[in-house]
Amino acid sequence: PGPPPGPPRVSPDPRAELDSTVLLTRSLLADTRQLAAQLRDKFPADGDHNLDSLPTLAMSAGALGALQLPGVLTRLRADLLSYLRHVQWLRRAGGSSLKTLEPELGTLQARLDRLLRRLQLLMSRLALPQPPPDPPAPPLAPPSSAWGGIRAAHAILGGLHLTLDWAVRGLLLLKTRL
């Protein structure tokens, strides 16, 4: 065995990485909030909108105390992956009315992808279990009408907002345990 190829540079400590993941999640939460408000201004929501294919909210704020690091990161990754696929679907099949949300929707998609990469890197650095995401659900059918696309957008952005809000709280709590 030979010598290592020069002194390695120190990559971010996983605790510092958790900090930057929290910042990225907060920034994504602000983007989502802003985009949801933009959508409400253009197409006011008539009540709550649901989409059966979206993940159920991971955890109530009250249950956060019992969380374990692997469980949070695994669940968060799976849920965000689902939202990423829904945002991609929305951009592809949402119809002309939703084109008014570009380029913000594209930026949201890119940041969501970046957050997913960051979470996976954190799990790798900590050597936590990385179960595969749930098998992809059948492809989402295009909305039946322009209003169907708008209702789906309300549901996706609303659900993503709640998930990211939960994620920030969960990650901050986990930081104290690392």
Epitope: P8, Q130, P133
Partner: antibody, heavy 114, light 111 residues
Framework: EVQLLESGGGLVQPGGSLRLSCAAS????????MHWVRQAPGKGLEWVAV????????YYADSVKGRFTISRDNSKNTLYLQMNSLRAEDTAVYYC???????WGQGTLVTVSS | QSVLTQPPSASGTPGQRVTISCSGS?????????VHWYQQLPGTAPKLLIY???ERPSGVPDRFSGSKSGTSASLAISGLRSEDEADYYC???????????FGGGTKLTVL
């Protein structure tokens, strides 16, 4: 400067045992998952085992399951690999690696031969 | 037999661009797990070259870049130099093995 220093390699007979150690410095050892990766002479890299940052999760390659045990002592910044029932095909340079792995030691040679 | 498949060898002349492929399956690269690339210079320990598909650790020149699509990934080296002559390995987490897997390695020769 990050340093991972393996020790404990050497010549051992088939069926014998060895314990490898890896002393870490220059980074927060207790915040990183740690791996053992080996490389047989003239061959590619083969992952052997991994242990989570706090020691609560351990995974092994099928080829070593039931024979090798990975462990760590965060108070001593040290990683271990206990190797039992050694076979000729376990002959390799054993690297200790941290994180993704981001950092690698220089390796220690284990030779299993009669 | 490695879980990730790489060509055993690749070559190029100085200044050229070379690409090394890494093919996986639905239990590793295709399962949304990130790909990492390592460079092993002769007689030395491996060194992390690319992580999370396309990120470079500090100190790695921007001549090195990575990409991923579906169940495969690739490493591109532009402006090839003689010091790039080394073995290159891809790696990714594999859910069926509950651990990382490596490609068989590609020996890059600079002609």
């Amino acid at each position: 400067e990050v340093q991972l220093l393996e020790s404990g390699g050497g010549l051992v007979q088939p069926g014998g045992s060895l314990r490898l150690s890896c002393a870490a410095s220059g980074f927060t050892f207790s915040s990183y998952g740690m791996h053992w990766v080996r490389q047989a002479p003239g061959k590619g890299l083969e992952w052997v085992a991994v242990i989570s940052y706090d020691g609560s999760y351990k995974y092994y390659a099928d080829s070593v399951k039931g024979r090798f045990t990975i462990s760590r002592d965060n108070s001593k910044n040290t990683l271990y690999l206990q190797m039992n029932s050694l076979r000729a095909e376990d002959t390799a340079v054993y690297y200790c690696a941290a994180g993704v792995p981001d950092y690698w030691g220089q390796g220690t040679l284990v030779t299993v031969s009669s | 037999q490695s879980v990730l498949t790489q060509p055993p060898s690749a070559s190029g002349t100085p200044g050229q661009r070379v690409t090394i492929s890494c093919s996986g399956s639905s239990s590793n690269i295709g399962s949304d797990y990130d790909v990492h690339w390592y460079q092993q210079l002769p007689g030395t320990a491996p060194k992390l070259l690319i992580y999370s598909n396309n990120e470079r650790p500090s100190g790695v020149p921007d001549r090195f870049s990575g990409s991923k699509s579906g169940t495969s990934a690739s490493l591109a080296i532009s402006g090839l130099r003689s010091e790039d002559e080394a073995d290159y390995y891809c790696a990714a987490w594999d859910s069926s093995l509950s651990g990382p897997v490596f490609g068989g390695g590609t020996k890059l020769t600079v002609l």
